[in-house]
Interface confidence: low
């Protein structure tokens, strides 16, 4: 037999030769970070063939690293299901903890024995400085140094110093989440007012006031004979803007050129139709209505328009 | 590996401001936070504050509220710390380390001095 | 706050024998987790100060094994073994619990 087969789990004892006579049998021993597990056999003989009889490293088995058990609040987890060397063990935390440490430890194999690669990590509470303080408002446990993983703060605005009030745009409640990062950026408190929105040929029909602030919402519809050109539901936006923009009353014109209507007062504007003159966004005439200025429409009132400060 | 460079020696009057740069490198610079030292000469370590290098949270120490303003560039690793008013006690040497709150200052900076004098 | 002695403030020592310092607070630094927040670091002279031992008893990486940390609560101490010229300077103790406070310091000297 030419020479014996080579394992990765182990090794010949003693010194190959360049061949072996029938019947010679050669003994294996396993090799260092391995060790054996009987009843396996670990030897072999040069066959009549001139082939040696099957033997495998089956028998010897990695050395393993100690047993590491979960940190608290958190998990142990080897990669692999296994505490054998060349293998990783991942750490974990529990939803409101991070780890302290090495995520990954290595079991490595150092002479003879297998040992990590570092001390096992631990889960601590998730934690948060304190949130952003802001210009013009302030947060509920002020006096707080640390927050804890769900430890919530809300936002309120200052009393303003001017006759119109601070606004909280945003979300005024935040909480300590993971990574210690707070759930979303901190609010602002501003001053926000939009102007008094006129719509010519048509009246506000809620959202009364003065004033308009955040969030302030108003709603609209034309006189008869004219159809709104836009939304009918305005809300005061964060930039002192209405959004969607304050809609206009556009006359209804007749649906051809060829004669005018018989009526000379304004189209009717009943609900249940859906005619171009319908106050709510129907479908419209299917050609834009010229855009004038008829002489004689009543002005907004001086001073209606609410300048912003 | 990890290394915390800082900025060189300052000398201000008092009522000045001073800006302290600390650069990073050897690790991820948003996965940690740097927390900011001071020595004063001769004696022990003050801790001054700390900065999220990930979101830019910052938790400073009660005495210098007010004064003092940490800050981070991501896109360069570095992180800052001002301290505004200068007074003749604010002469130390002044560190910056990496660490969360709760946990170990395994890295430093080199230190920088400040020195405030009329 | 959470104030943090330590004793002796100067400890004069001889290469190759063991020294010992201690370190209080003034509340105790043991955590529900079962750690304690507590630090030792190193400065030596001309140099910044390095992490010794963290959570009360672990050597950080690279710390020679002369170097050990014990105590729980509010007393803890920090022992080496057999002292070395190289481990001269000033020993602060810290805790990292309640933000952080550093004890005054223990200078370290050869006889």
């Known amino acids: 037999c030419e020479e014996p087969p080579t394992f990765e789990a182990m090794e010949l004892i003693g010194k190959p030769k360049p061949y072996y006579e029938i019947g010679e049998r050669v003994d294996y021993k396993c090799k260092k970070g391995y060790f054996y597990i009987p009843p396996l056999a670990t030897h072999t003989i040069c066959d009549r063939n001139h082939t040696w009889l099957p033997v495998s490293d089956d028998a010897c088995y990695r050395e393993t690293c100690p047993y590491i058990r979960d940190p608290l609040n958190g998990q142990a987890v080897p990669a692999n299901g296994t505490y054998e060397f060349g293998y990783q063990m991942h750490f974990i935390c529990n939803e409101g903890y991070y780890l302290i440490g090495e995520e990954i430890l290595y079991c490595e194999l150092k002479g003879s024995v297998a040992i990590w690669s570092g001390k096992p990590p631990i889960c601590e509470k998730v934690l948060c400085t304190p949130p952003p303080k802001i210009k013009n408002g302030k947060h509920t446990f002020s006096e707080v140094e640390v927050f804890e993983y769900l430890d919530a703060v809300t936002y309120s605005c200052d009393p303003a110093p001017g006759p119109d009030p601070f606004s909280l745009i945003g979300e005024s409640t935040i909480y300590c989440g993971d990574n210690s990062v707070w759930s979303r950026a901190a609010p602002e408190c501003k001053v926000v007012k939009c102007r008094f929105p006129v719509v010519e040929n048509g009246k506000q029909i809620s959202g009364f006031g003065k004033k308009f602030y955040y969030k302030a919402t108003v709603m609209f519809e034309c006189d008869k004979g004219f159809y709104l050109d836009g939304s009918d539901t305005i809300v005061c936006d964060s930039n002192s803007t209405w959004d969607p923009p304050v809609p206009k009353c556009l006359k209804v014109l007749p649906p051809s050129s060829t004669k005018p209507p018989a009526l000379s007062h304004s189209v009717s504007t009943s609900s249940t139709t859906k005619s171009p003159a319908s106050s709510a966004s129907g479908p419209r005439p299917t050609y834009k209505p010229p855009v004038s200025n008829y002489p004689g429409y009543p002005k907004p009132e001086e001073g209606i328009l609410d300048s912003l400060d | 590996q990890v290394q915390l460079v800082q900025s060189g020696a300052e000398v201000k009057k008092p009522g000045a401001s001073v800006k302290v740069s600390c650069k990073a490198s050897g690790y991820t610079f948003t996965s940690y936070g740097i927390s900011w030292v001071r020595q004063a000469p001769g004696q022990g370590l003050e801790w001054m504050g700390w900065i999220s290098a990930y979101n830019g949270n910052t938790n400073y120490a009660q005495k210098l509220q007010g004064r003092v303003t940490m800050t981070t560039d991501t896109s360069t690793s570095t992180a800052y710390m001002e301290l505004r008013s200068l007074r003749s006690d604010d002469t130390a040497v002044y560190y910056c380390a990496r660490g969360f709150p709760r946990t170990s200052f395994d890295s430093w900076g080199q230190g920088t001095l400040v020195t405030v004098s009329s | 706050d959470i104030v943090m002695t330590q004793s002796p403030l100067s400890l004069p020592v001889t290469p190759g024998e063991p020294a010992s310092i201690s370190c209080r607070s003034s509340?105790?630094?043991?955590?529900?987790?079962?750690?304690?927040?507590l630090d030792w670091y190193l400065q030596k002279p001309g140099q910044s100060p390095q992490l010794l031992i963290y959570?009360?008893?672990n050597r950080a990486s690279g710390v020679p094994d002369r170097f050990s940390g014990s105590g729980s609560g509010t007393d803890f101490t920090l022992k080496i073994s057999r002292v070395e010229a190289e481990d001269v300077g000033v020993y602060y103790c810290m805790q990292a619990l309640q933000t952080f406070t550093f004890g005054p310091g223990t200078k370290v000297e050869i006889k």
């Open positions: 509340q105790s630094l043991l955590h529900s987790n079962g750690y304690n927040y």
């Open positions: 959570l009360g008893s």
